[in-house]
């Protein structure tokens, strides 16, 4: 058992033209509230129940009102963060639907009005127990920056929180058939049971002899399920509901995809996943040849000459499934090393890469100095992915090559007047000041503020600046 | 502005049958999935069936299969229920409301609603 903790950081315009209109106004305020929705594995063809690994909703964020005529900014946020309790062991792979909607909070006959903003998907891999990671994704206009982490919830431990650890009970060694938990060599894997009669569907334990129930369930062995509270109410017509969730069918309720197709939820209907020879909706098409065109985005049919030959797609970057009907979020997979951006072109995958890096996927650290000279005398400094020269004295400019003016930045104080020398400048003093900068006035008595002129040097003698 | 206006409910004998409408403005039903809601006394809400005009999908939920039909004319902006073969407990305030997939949870599909009607209500009894 363990918890999935999503932190959003912030969520507003993204990079480049078109910065989306904002989706509050005075008129209409709204607040703004997140829901994610984890499936485990990574694969897309995966029929696995909806959000199976589990979902949240984040606690609603500040009323924001749009200013007129203001570009819309990082919208405020929700404090806290999004827990998803895991029961089993974490997968270690992953998928991940982020939905932003908006609560408009303006006087509808009815109340709030919920309405999505933005959702973004990825597929992931990530160890339980390990630092956060950050992420950002755009979905449109829009931009989302967030991190994530999986933790176990104590006695569990491991990267897959599958692994029970108890502190010993005798000091020398554990029990028998019982190993060491490491790095936790003080205390001992031990066995969990829940108390008996709990249900295993909708109860869970982590103390021995417990019975926790899931969302949804409640009872004393978890079998009860809990009723919704009401959400509905006659208050005229057109009212906006609180956005409040109710029970219904399963969107894939007795399967509708024919001839062995997959079916998986979205939020208005389904989608089916076709095995090979079928297409359509539900994958009620079958007998296709090439000659019906079964590959779409550009996809290469080979073979299917006749009904009873299977036909295969081959398909373009950036498209996948048996008919090419499935863009590929390469993106989501990381390809780009070293903290790259990856940027998804549909005809091909590209890296920007961060400063020092560089190849297609920006797998090659650059030495910063290599085959860089500094002129003059300069020697080259590596810092941040990017080389700069230290000059030699009276040189400057980013190689050297520029002769410096040691006077340009009027360094004699109080009137002093500046000559460049081949060791550095030199000051010569108004009367009544001395030092290598003319910054010490000399007392009236003939004294100086210093301590003592250096020999050689009488106040008002030019000083050199060494 | 959105409104969903319910309407075709009564009072009818156990056996018996009704079409309700739900007459849809302010945005096009043809690109949104309508479902219809009903609240019994002393019960939660509960989703009953959903349409998504656009692929004629729809779905029902375990204790309506086979006696309720949900249907749309997109022409029209309006959405339908007919109710037939109807038991008293199906008694209820019957909601047409804009819904939306929401998550899995505990055995349990859930939805989001958008926004609903003012219901209409329709007795069951002999």
């Known amino acids: 058992a363990g918890v999935f903790e999503l932190q959003i950081h912030s969520f507003g315009p993204g990079p480049g033209p078109g910065a989306p209109r904002s989706p509050c106004s005075a008129r209409l305020p709204c607040r703004l509230f997140f829901r994610v929705c984890l499936k485990p594995g990574l694969s897309e063809e995966a029929a696995e129940s909806p959000c199976a690994l589990g979902a949240a909703l984040s606690a609603r964020g500040p009323v924001y009102t749009e200013q007129p005529g203001a570009p819309a900014p990082d919208l405020p946020l929700p404090d806290g963060l999004l827990q998803v309790p895991f029961r089993d062991a974490w997968p270690g792979t992953f998928s991940f639907i982020i939905e932003t909607w908006r609560e408009e909070l303006g006087d509808q006959i009815g109340g709030p009005a919920w309405s999505l903003l933005a959702r973004v998907a990825g597929r992931r891999r990530l160890a339980a127990g390990g630092p956060w990671a950050r992420d950002i994704q755009r979905a449109g206009a829009w931009e989302l920056r967030f991190s994530y982490r999986a933790r176990c919830e104590p006695p569990a431990v491991g990267t897959a929180c599958t692994r029970l650890c108890r502190p010993r009970s005798a000091p020398s060694r554990c029990g028998p058939g019982l190993r060491p938990c490491a790095p936790l060599e003080d205390e001992c894997e031990a066995p969990l049971v829940c108390r008996a009669g709990c249900s295993p569907e909708h109860g869970f334990c982590e103390q021995p002899g417990e019975c926790r129930c899931l969302e949804g369930w409640t009872g004393p062995l978890c079998t009860v399920p809990v009723s919704t509270s009401s959400c509905l109410s006659p208050r005229g017509p057109s009212s906006a509901t609180t956005g409040c969730l109710v029970p219904g069918p399963g969107p894939c309720d007795g399967n509708p995809c024919a001839n062995g197709g997959s079916c998986s939820e979205t939020p208005r209907s389904f989608e089916c996943t076709c095995p090979r020879g079928f297409y359509g909706l539900r994958c009620e098409v079958s007998g296709v040849t090439c000659a019906d065109g079964p590959c779409f985005n550009g996809g290469l049919c080979v073979g299917g000459a006749d009904p009873d030959s299977a036909y295969i797609c081959h398909c373009p970057p950036g498209f996948q499934g048996s008919n090419c009907e499935k863009r590929v979020d390469r993106c989501s997979l990381q390809p780009c090393r070293n903290g790259g951006l990856c940027l998804d072109l549909g005809h091909a995958l590209r890296c920007r890469c961060r400063a020092g890096f560089a190849g297609p996927r920006c797998e090659h650290d650059l030495d910063d100095c290599a085959g860089r000279a500094c002129a003059n005398g300069g020697t080259c400094v590596e810092g941040g992915g990017a080389h700069r020269c230290s000059c030699a004295l009276g040189f400057g400019g980013r190689d050297c090559r520029e002769r410096a003016d040691p006077c340009a930045a009027r360094p004699c104080a109080h009137g002093g007047r500046c000559y460049a020398h081949f060791s550095g400048l030199v000051c010569a003093c108004a009367p009544g000041y001395m030092g290598a900068r003319c910054e010490f006035p000399v007392h009236p008595d003939g004294a100086s503020a210093l301590p003592a002129a250096p020999p050689g040097l009488r106040p008002g003698d030019p000083q050199r600046y060494l | 502005e959105v409104q969903l206006v319910e309407s075709g409910g009564g009072l009818v004998q156990p056996g018996g049958s009704l079409r309700l409408s739900c007459a849809a403005s302010g945005f096009n039903i043809s690109e949104e999935s309508i479902g219809w809601v009903r609240r019994a006394p002393g019960k939660g809400e509960e989703l009953v069936a959903r349409i998504y005009p656009t692929n004629g999908y729809t779905r029902y939920a375990d204790s309506v299969k086979g006696r309720f039909t949900i249907s749309a004319d997109t022409s029209k902006n309006t959405a339908y229920l007919q109710m037939n073969s109807l038991r008293a407990e199906d008694t209820a305030v019957y909601y047409c409301?804009?819904?939306?997939?929401?998550?899995?949870?505990?055995?349990?599909?859930?939805?989001?609603?958008?926004?609903s009607g003012q219901g209409t209500l329709v007795t069951v009894s002999s």
């Open positions: 409301a804009r819904s939306y997939y929401a998550h899995y949870s505990a055995g349990y599909y859930y939805y989001a609603l958008d926004y």
